[in-house]
């Protein structure tokens, strides 16, 4: 069993999470997850849900009844969600720690906007993809 | 050209982000973006940046001068990031307005946990994957 | 044994703004969680806020998130619900209470309560 399992049911204690009023409402995550099948698609979801728990948990860690248990699911995230690649967790964190009302921010933001959205679509990524794609919107003109 | 790019110098004029002095301190987005090539860690990294896109976009849309730029953008990034899937964005609307501190849904948020976690490696979503990689595993184990 | 007071209750009108506080004696209030209840007319005492002994590990009762915030002073010993844009079923008896260690928001110490009208 991977260790979050017995830190997530303690979690689960501690919020009194376990009660049967907490599934009134549909899900939070779940329900999103199972409309994704693709692998860039649920990349695109997770991303937004492993920042949810680390903000949870950044908002909890004055609680040391559960600290421990926290640990261990932020290291077991770390080895999920970002292989145990440190880089790929660094540069996730500094991404969800940018400030939206910094006006530094604001303004380097602004000045990326064309490149960033230049690489948003995967197409961008690559000469050959670009390529074959003009190739299919053209067959599909003329057809 | 895009209809962005336009409405992307119509935003750097508004927040003086075409200055020389906004390149100070390096970039927020542009070097993160290049540090990954592979589709899924992409992904990854423009969920966050997109989110905050939307973020910033949000903070300022009652200055009336750029809301026809923002709105521009907004609708050119659901054409690129979400291939115009308006259940895509929708889906990940949601995931961004979760609050935090919120208990109803910090106590839904761990409820999930368990099996949100044992979603998040690629591997965990099918059976073929996970038994390659049981494989490979066993390969490196006994050499 | 912990003594709370609240303060800051009264009749005010739909949209407005309320501040309440309570200050704790007779324990080490730096240590120790804090939170906010009410009990509206006829019914029973309900959860509304809490915040952990250092100004994090927040929570909301979902009827007052975006409207509500607690804060607190260590330094004075006191815990602050600012509510804002309050609304009729707001009105209740506001209880402040110390909350058990390890729990996200068992009280083990109560205030007397202040009340806090709403009139439409």
């Known amino acids: 069993q991977d260790p979050y399992v017995k830190e997530a049911e303690n979690l689960k204690k501690y919020f009194n999470a376990g009660h049967s009023d907490v599934a009134d409402n549909g899900t939070l995550f779940l329900g999103i997850l199972k409309n994704w099948k693709e692998e860039s698609d649920r990349k695109i979801m997770q991303s937004q849900i492993v920042s949810f728990y680390f903000k949870l948990f950044k908002n909890f860690k004055d609680d040391q009844s559960i600290q421990k248990s926290v640990e261990t699911i932020k290291e077991d995230m770390n080895v999920k969600f970002f292989n145990s690649n440190k880089k790929k967790r660094d540069d996730f964190e500094k991404l969800t720690n940018y400030s939206v009302t910094d006006l530094n921010v604001q303004r380097k933001a602004i000045h990326e906007l064309i490149q960033v959205m230049a690489e948003l679509s995967p197409a961008a990524k690559t000469g050959k993809r670009k390529r074959s794609q003009m190739l299919f919107r053209g067959r599909r003109a003329s057809q | 050209q895009d209809p962005y790019v336009k409405e992307a110098e119509n935003l750097k004029k508004y927040f003086n982000a075409g200055h020389s002095d906004v390149a100070d301190n390096g970039t927020l987005f542009l070097g993160i973006l290049k540090n990954w090539k592979e589709e899924s860690d992409r992904k990854i990294m423009q969920s966050q940046i997109v989110s905050f896109y939307f973020k910033l976009f949000k903070n300022f849309k009652d200055d009336q001068s750029i809301q026809k730029s923002v709105e521009t953008i907004k609708e050119d990034m659901n054409v690129k990031f979400f291939n115009s899937n308006k259940k895509k964005r929708d889906d990940f609307e949601k995931l961004t307005n979760y609050s935090v501190t919120d208990l109803n849904v910090q106590r839904k948020a761990i409820h999930e946990l368990i099996q949100v976690m044992a979603e998040l490696s690629p591997a965990a979503k099918t059976g073929k994957r996970k038994r390659s990689q049981m494989l490979f595993r066993g390969r490196r184990a006994s050499q | 044994q912990v003594q709370l007071v609240e303060s800051g209750g009264g009749l005010v009108q739909t949209g407005d703004s309320l501040r309440l506080s309570c200050v704790a004696s007779?324990?080490?209030?730096?240590?120790?969680?804090m939170g906010w209840f009410r009990q509206p007319p006829g019914k029973e005492r309900d959860f509304v806020a809490r915040?952990?002994?250092?100004?994090?590990?927040?929570s909301y009762a979902t009827s007052v998130e975006g409207r509500f915030a607690i804060s607190r002073d260590n330094a004075k010993n006191t815990v602050y619900l600012q509510m804002n844009s309050l609304k009729p079923e707001d009105t209740a008896v506001y209880y402040c209470?110390?909350?058990?260690?390890?729990?996200?928001?068992?009280?083990?110490?109560w205030g007397q309560g202040t009340q806090v009208t709403v009139s439409s």
């Open positions: 915040i952990g002994y250092s100004g994090q590990s927040i």
């Open positions: 209470a110390s909350l058990v260690s390890g729990t996200l928001y068992k009280p083990n110490y």
């Open positions: 007779g324990g080490t209030f730096s240590r120790y969680a």
